[in-house]
């Protein structure tokens, strides 16, 4: 080019449809030039022009050559120059925001711009770049990068940013600029000018103002707060602690808090001081509701569902920034609120549903809500499946007879299409309960019966009820306890029946023991004895409760005696026993000892025995007739335990084994024995029957039976030199060696002669006696053997 | 814990000087504003100065005005009461309290006797 | 300055009883109020703040309210631990100013 000629063409675009080409003009040339500008393209195009600028239209990929001729005054120049796509330039336009505003309850900038689309002809990427600026020096908060994507018509665009701090703090500015990332265009591509600024800012009133006001923030989170004031701020804090200032446009000042913990429950304070007062505010730092925890649903009465959860974490919020929480149920789209003032039992909360006609399965959710967020659970239920029925009321207990009842009881609810399994709680006083189980049909009028059998006559009964569902979820709670006497019934056995021989031989005695409860069926009045023969049947008067026993004068003949017990109902059966034992010859009379507690007695199988066995016992030094008690064994025993409280250790009994055939009875064996043996009370009485020069003769008395206080097992006899009154040893005291002893363990051996003694001698005697007890006490003697003749 | 521990009390003659020292230990001292407080025997609470929590800002009751001074040394958690020009009327149990507006913690206080 | 009135300077109550406590302040203190109580040969002890908040540990017996110029303190059933002496103060403004304190004793 030469110099003087149009130099430095540069060419831009800002659709990609247009370039816009300016050049510099020839030095020296003045107002009055005119350009020729010819473009060589297919057709070869020239523009007269009196500016140094041209638009064109963009041309396709390749090189052209540009030829600018400059006419002024004097001369002409001529310029060529080769353009390419690649030499141009893409600008935008400078955007234009359409509206900035804001929220300022949550501290949000919201921004508009249209990014003019419609003059591109490709779909293009369009990078934007926002500024936020604050306060009047305009400091740089944020600069961030937005894509769009240009689509050949005018599109509106929307962004907004939340501010850390609260808008009402300090003038916010926003400023936009673009890049149009263009695939189609391989020329240099740089941003747009930046748009004109706009600004947000909050017109205070004439008060002083802390912002956020009343904030609900998250536990941990950071957050700034601010003064907007008139005066001078001298100081801000948080609980009782001070934060640093930092100083925003004017008196205006903010606060940081990072990290915020969890507030109690009337919030944390924030406040800021000037010197003559406090201005403040209160932020309220929690949790987002927990996932409803344990969330279960069932009903009582298939009217209502009752729905329960536990909300899980506290969330340190309450009043109106409390969780509320939405029970939905979707299959219907019925929902139910809980409202707060049902404060929750026990940590858990409730909410009730109506059931709705012919809608078994329910689908329900939880929804949980606060200001910091929201969480939900789901439970699917069948609530057929799921009924916990009420505690059962009005429990009544009926007789139908003396072994049925019939129960009686309240359950509210609409039932009809389940069934109930109940179980009855039965006790009997004094033993272990029993439970039955029951299924029922399921009522609509919640009125429910039962009949119970299998009870026992006049039997105190404690009954209660409880009940769930065949399919079982729950059982209700237990109904209240009724107690309940069944009717009287006859009794079952007559009574256990035995008879004596008066001593003198002449009466029958007739000893009867009182029906168990379990037997008797009732409260026994009176019994019935009679006694019958071959000939004829005798029937004594009528003997009223308690009176066991009855006397009847018989002769030696066989006859049978028959005991009845009588209740309101009717009578027992006989009780049956001859008068007359079976005789037994070859008896002897055996020795037993027991256990401490009782004694144990066998025997030998005996088929002939075909009722029963019976053993009697008595006191030995009780006189006859001898009956303390007796015990009935089955026919199939062959031993038994006898234990009564009335026996005492070192007393001795007798024991009698009888064998019972057709109501007779036989005495199988006859034992004397002790529970327990104890050691002789008193030492045998013993005398000197005789004495010579070298011996003595001693003879002694047995001891009484109760005195004794076992079996005897033998006597123990000691001798030795000893004097009466004399300081000399006695002969029990131990380290003598002269003292001889004799064991007799013959028992029936009475007296004993003591030889080989020295003549003119006093000798010390000692008798004692032993059972397997222990040895008695002793009882002593002195004696002088004669002189030698 | 929070602790503070007054020191530095004890009998002096009026027109003397005495200086009272509380240790702050357990929390973040230069988090928090300072307060002396006094309670003469038998009479009610007194407050006498505050000091902010930078030492920045320091106040006093009018009738320690001029004779007394707080300050505060943040690098050994210490807060400082110096007494000038003692009056009888000084007499009291001297507390050391945290918190600028509101006294959330108090030493068990020191006995400042002032008498002839 | 602000001046802090008590009322009554004495109140004789049995356990069990229901205690109410009356400040007054010379001029509109807002909320700006706290109370404190405190036993023989002991420092003063932080229960309320801002008139009605509760300081963390104190028993949910204790509770305030009132503002401008008139607060109560109300203690709803008096334990034996709070015959003590009560005193209330504003803190709106410098210089802090107590109130003359209330002595709750055993009847």
């Known amino acids: 080019q030469k110099k003087g000629a149009p130099h430095d063409l540069k060419c831009v675009t800002n659709n990609l449809q247009v370039w816009d080409c300016y050049w510099k003009a020839p030095s020296g040339t003045g107002r009055g030039t005119d350009y020729e500008v010819c473009i060589e393209n297919r057709s070869h195009s020239c523009y007269q022009l009196e500016k140094t600028n041209i638009k064109i239209p963009a041309l396709s990929h390749g090189d052209y050559e540009i030829t600018i001729n400059s006419l002024h005054d004097f001369g002409s120049s001529t310029s060529k120059f080769t353009l390419n796509e690649q030499n141009v330039s893409l600008i935008p336009d400078t955007p234009e925001i359409l509206n900035l505003s804001a929220d300022f309850s949550t501290s949000t900038l919201y921004l508009k711009w249209n990014d003019r689309g419609s003059v591109f002809p490709h779909h293009s990427n369009v990078i934007w770049e926002i500024k936020i600026l604050r306060k009047e020096s305009m400091e740089l908060v944020k600069l961030v990068t937005h894509n769009t994507t240009l689509n050949g018509k005018d599109t509106l665009h929307h962004w907004s940013w939340a501010s850390d701090m609260p808008l009402e703090c300090a003038i916010h500015f926003v400023e936009i600029r673009c890049y149009i990332d263009s695939l189609h265009f391989s020329g240099r591509k740089e941003w747009s000018d930046w748009s004109p600024v706009k600004n947000i800012s909050w017109m205070p009133d004439s008060q002083t103002k802390v912002f956020p006001q009343d904030k609900v923030i998250l536990v941990g989170s950071d957050i700034t707060f601010c003064c907007i004031s008139q005066e001078k701020v001298l100081s801000a804090l948080i609980g009782h602690t001070n934060c640093p200032l930092i100083h925003l446009d004017g008196e205006n000042v903010a606060i940081k808090i990072h990290n915020i913990s969890v507030s109690a429950s009337s919030g944390t304070n924030v406040v800021f001081t000037t010197e003559d007062n406090i201005f403040g505010t209160v932020i309220f730092a929690g949790y987002p509701p927990d996932t409803p925890q344990q969330l279960n649903c069932e009903t009582h009465d298939l009217k209502e569902i009752l729905c329960r959860w536990n909300p899980g974490r506290a969330t340190a919020l309450v009043g109106p920034r409390a969780t509320s929480y939405t029970l939905l149920e979707s299959f219907s789209g019925k929902y139910v609120r809980f409202k707060r003032a049902e404060a929750p039992t026990n940590g858990s909360y409730q909410l009730f549903f109506q059931m709705l006609p012919n809608q078994e399965i329910y689908n329900f959710t939880l929804n949980a809500h606060n200001p910091l967020g929201r969480s939900e659970s789901t439970i699917l239920v069948n609530i057929t499946e799921k009924v916990y029925p009420h505690t059962p009321t009005s429990f009544k207990v009926k007789d139908i007879n003396s072994t049925a009842v019939k129960l009686s009881w309240h359950l509210p609810g609409n039932f009809a299409k389940i069934n109930f399994l109940c179980q009855i709680e039965i006790k009997k006083s004094n033993t272990v309960q029993e439970q039955r189980n029951v299924t029922i049909k399921g009522v609509e009028n919640s009125s429910y019966l039962v009949a119970l059998d299998k009870l026992n006559p006049y039997t105190v009964y404690t009954f209660r009820i409880r009940c769930s569902t065949e399919t079982f979820w729950k059982w209700s709670k237990w109904s209240n306890k009724k107690q309940h006497l069944t009717t009287e019934a006859i009794p079952s056995k007559g009574p256990d029946t035995w008879r004596e021989w008066s001593s003198d031989g002449k009466n029958l005695i007739i000893y009867w023991k009182p029906l168990p409860i379990n037997e008797a069926n009732g409260k026994i009045l009176s019994y019935n004895v009679s006694c019958s023969s071959d000939e004829e049947t005798q029937s004594l008067s009528e003997i009223p409760d308690p009176q066991h026993k009855a006397e009847i004068q018989l002769d030696k003949n066989d006859y049978i005696i028959s005991v009845v017990a009588k209740n309101s109902v009717g009578s027992s059966p006989p009780s049956k026993i001859a008068s007359m034992e079976i005789p037994n010859d070859d008896l002897k009379i055996e020795q037993v000892v027991g256990m401490g507690k009782g004694i144990l007695l066998t025997w030998h199988y005996d088929p002939n025995m075909t009722c029963d066995y019976v053993i009697k016992w008595c006191n030995s030094s009780r006189s006859e007739p001898c009956l303390m008690d007796w015990r009935k064994v089955p026919s199939n025993s062959t031993e038994t335990v006898i234990e009564s409280d009335q026996f005492r250790p070192g007393v001795r009994y007798n024991f009698f084994l009888y064998g019972c055939r057709n109501q007779g009875y036989q005495l199988l064996r006859s034992m004397i024995g002790y529970i327990e043996e104890l050691a002789p009370t008193v030492a045998p009485n013993f005398t000197v029957e005789d004495t010579s020069a070298d011996s003595i003769l001693v003879k002694w008395e047995d001891i009484p039976v109760e005195e004794l206080r076992g079996f005897l097992r033998g006597y123990l006899f000691y001798f030795g030199k000893g004097e009466r009154d004399t300081s000399k040893m006695r002969v029990l005291e131990s380290g003598r060696s002269d003292i001889k002893v004799k064991n007799i363990t013959d028992i029936s051996q009475k007296t004993l002669r003591i030889a080989d003694l020295q003549g003119k001698t006093s000798y010390h005697l000692v008798l004692r006696a032993y059972t397997d007890g222990g040895v008695g006490p002793e009882k002593s003697m002195y004696v002088v053997t004669k002189e030698n003749s | 814990q929070v602790q503070l521990v007054e020191s530095g009390g004890g009998v002096v003659q009026p027109g003397r000087s005495l200086r009272l020292s509380c240790a702050a230990s357990?929390?973040?001292?230069?988090?928090?504003?300072m307060n002396w407080v006094r309670q003469a025997p038998g009479k009610g609470l007194e407050w006498v100065a505050v000091?902010?929590?930078?030492?920045?800002?320091?106040y006093y009751a009018d009738s320690v005005k001029g004779r007394f001074t707080i300050s505060r040394d943040n690098s050994k958690n210490t807060l400082y009461l110096q007494m000038n020009s003692l009056r009888a009327e000084d007499t009291a149990i001297y507390y050391c309290?945290?918190?600028?507006?509101?006294?959330?913690?108090w030493g068990r206080g020191t006995l400042v006797t002032v008498s002839s | 300055d602000i001046q802090m009135t008590q009322s009554p300077s004495t109140l004789s109550a049995s356990v069990g009883d229901r205690v109410t406590i009356t400040c007054r302040a010379s001029?509109?203190?807002?909320?700006?109020l706290a109370w404190y109580q405190q036993k023989p040969g002991k420092a003063p002890n932080l229960l309320m703040y801002?008139?009605?908040n509760l300081e963390n540990g104190v028993s949910s017996r204790f509770s305030g309210s009132g503002s401008g110029t008139e607060f109560t303190l109300t203690i709803t059933s008096l334990q034996p631990d709070d015959f003590a002496t009560y005193y209330c103060?504003?803190?709106?403004?410098?210089?802090?100013?107590f109130g003359g304190g209330t002595k709750v004793e055993i009847k």
């Open positions: 309290a945290r918190g600028q507006l509101v006294q959330d913690f």
């Open positions: 357990g929390f973040t001292f230069s988090s928090y504003g």
């Open positions: 000091i902010w929590f930078d030492g920045s800002i320091k």
């Open positions: 001029q509109s203190i807002s909320s700006w």
């Open positions: 801002k008139a009605s």
């Open positions: 103060q504003q803190y709106k403004s410098n210089p802090l100013t």
